[in-house]
């Protein structure tokens, strides 16, 4: 990864960063002064505009998600975005501010009882009703109520990373999300090429820790595209 | 102690090039996305160009755009600003920007942070 430092002597505390863009390699999107952004009613100068090109949720901060800046815009550009309050429409939980979660499209509050039930539902909803277990484990077995903490610890059920522990991560496990040990040196991580290719992973694993980024393994450079081998590795 | 160190500033004709880079030294942590800042004299701060290096995704202010392009070497922990058809109007002093890394590191807000600056003073 790029590694990036912080300046003691920088600018701290200025207004949160309303945007940035991603899309395809190389592509270019423009900062304009007053753009809209979904979720809020007012323009935002060029002044205090800070876009943070993000590619997921993770790059952005406990109170952002990643998503495209407009409605119906191109599907790859995407910015940090203010997180949506309660009863903001919403399309998946890290859109929602923490304390929320997403559900029919609305961003409620995620006391405990709401939360396991809707948790349970989105399986329901998603897989139907089928209670067939996968590799001896069952579907729901993730849910049992030992698993609501203050801050996750490893193997709690999580909606995004802010609700786990230090060193662990909201990842998901089987038909749910739960919290993972961040990866350490040498350990094997997941180099996603595509935009929600992370989507698609029934056991979804953790980013590289601080210091590291996922990079392929030097004895796999030869190896083909498809079996390269990538680890979490120094800078 | 941490810095982001700029260099390749100073006096340019209309109508030339420079180009910016931005050193990170000391301790780090590691950020996806790193930016460009400037600041006129009497004006305030104002975005230029940021980069989020994991998928060379980028967005420039429409002031810039076409003319500038940002870039970053990963394995040399610089980022780059590529400055052409340089006018007037573009003298500023330039201030490279690191991302904080997000909720990774616990920050509710990606936000960035600002190196020392390099004027960049474009005149006939």
């Known amino acids: 990864t790029l590694n990036s430092v912080l300046n003691s002597n920088a600018i701290k505390n200025l207004p949160p960063p309303l945007g940035g863009a991603a899309g395809h390699p190389g592509s270019a999107v423009s900062a304009a002064p007053g753009i809209l952004y979904p979720g809020g009613n007012k323009y935002q100068t060029i002044d205090n505009y800070q876009p943070y090109p993000c590619a997921e949720d993770e790059e952005c901060g406990t109170d952002e998600y990643c998503a495209s800046p407009t409605r119906g815009g191109d599907a790859g550009v995407q910015i940090c975005l203010a997180c949506r309050k309660r009863r903001k429409r919403c399309m998946r939980h890290a859109m929602c501010c923490p304390g929320n979660y997403c559900k029919n499209g609305i961003c409620v509050s995620s006391d405990q009882n709401h939360f396991r039930g809707e948790i349970e539902e989105t399986i329901t909803e998603s897989f139907g009703n089928d209670h067939s277990t996968l590799d001896g484990y069952s579907r729901r077995t993730t849910l049992s109520s030992k698993m609501y903490h203050t801050k996750g610890q490893e193997g709690s059920v999580c909606l995004r990373s802010s609700d786990c522990a230090s060193g662990l991560c909201c990842a998901r496990h089987f038909w749910s999300k739960i919290c993972k040990p961040v990866l350490k040196e040498g350990q094997v991580c997941t180099k996603h090429r595509r935009k929600g290719s992370h989507g698609l992973e029934i056991f979804q694993r953790c980013y590289c820790g601080e210091g590291l980024s996922c990079r392929i393994q030097k004895d796999h450079h030869q190896a083909s595209n498809s079996s390269r081998l990538h680890t979490c590795q120094r800078h | 102690e941490v810095q982001l160190v700029e260099s390749g500033g100073g006096l340019v004709q209309p109508g030339g090039s420079l180009r910016l880079s931005c050193a990170a030294s000391?301790?780090?942590?590691?950020?996806?996305?790193m930016g460009w800042f400037r600041q006129a004299p009497g004006k305030e701060r104002e975005f230029v160009a940021a980069?989020?290096?994991?998928?060379?995704?980028?967005v420039y202010a429409d002031s810039v755009k076409g003319r500038f392009t940002i870039s970053a070497d990963n394995s040399k922990n610089t980022a780059y600003l590529q400055m052409n058809s340089l006018k007037p109007e573009d003298t500023a002093v330039y201030y490279c920007?690191?991302?904080?890394?997000?909720?990774?590191?616990?920050?509710?807000?990606?936000?960035?942070?600002w190196g020392q600056g390099t004027l960049v003073t474009v005149s006939s």
């Open positions: 980069i989020n290096w994991s998928g060379g995704l980028t």
């Open positions: 000391g301790r780090t942590f590691s950020s996806k996305t």
């Open positions: 920007a690191a991302g904080n890394g997000g909720r990774a590191y616990g920050y509710s807000r990606a936000r960035y942070e």
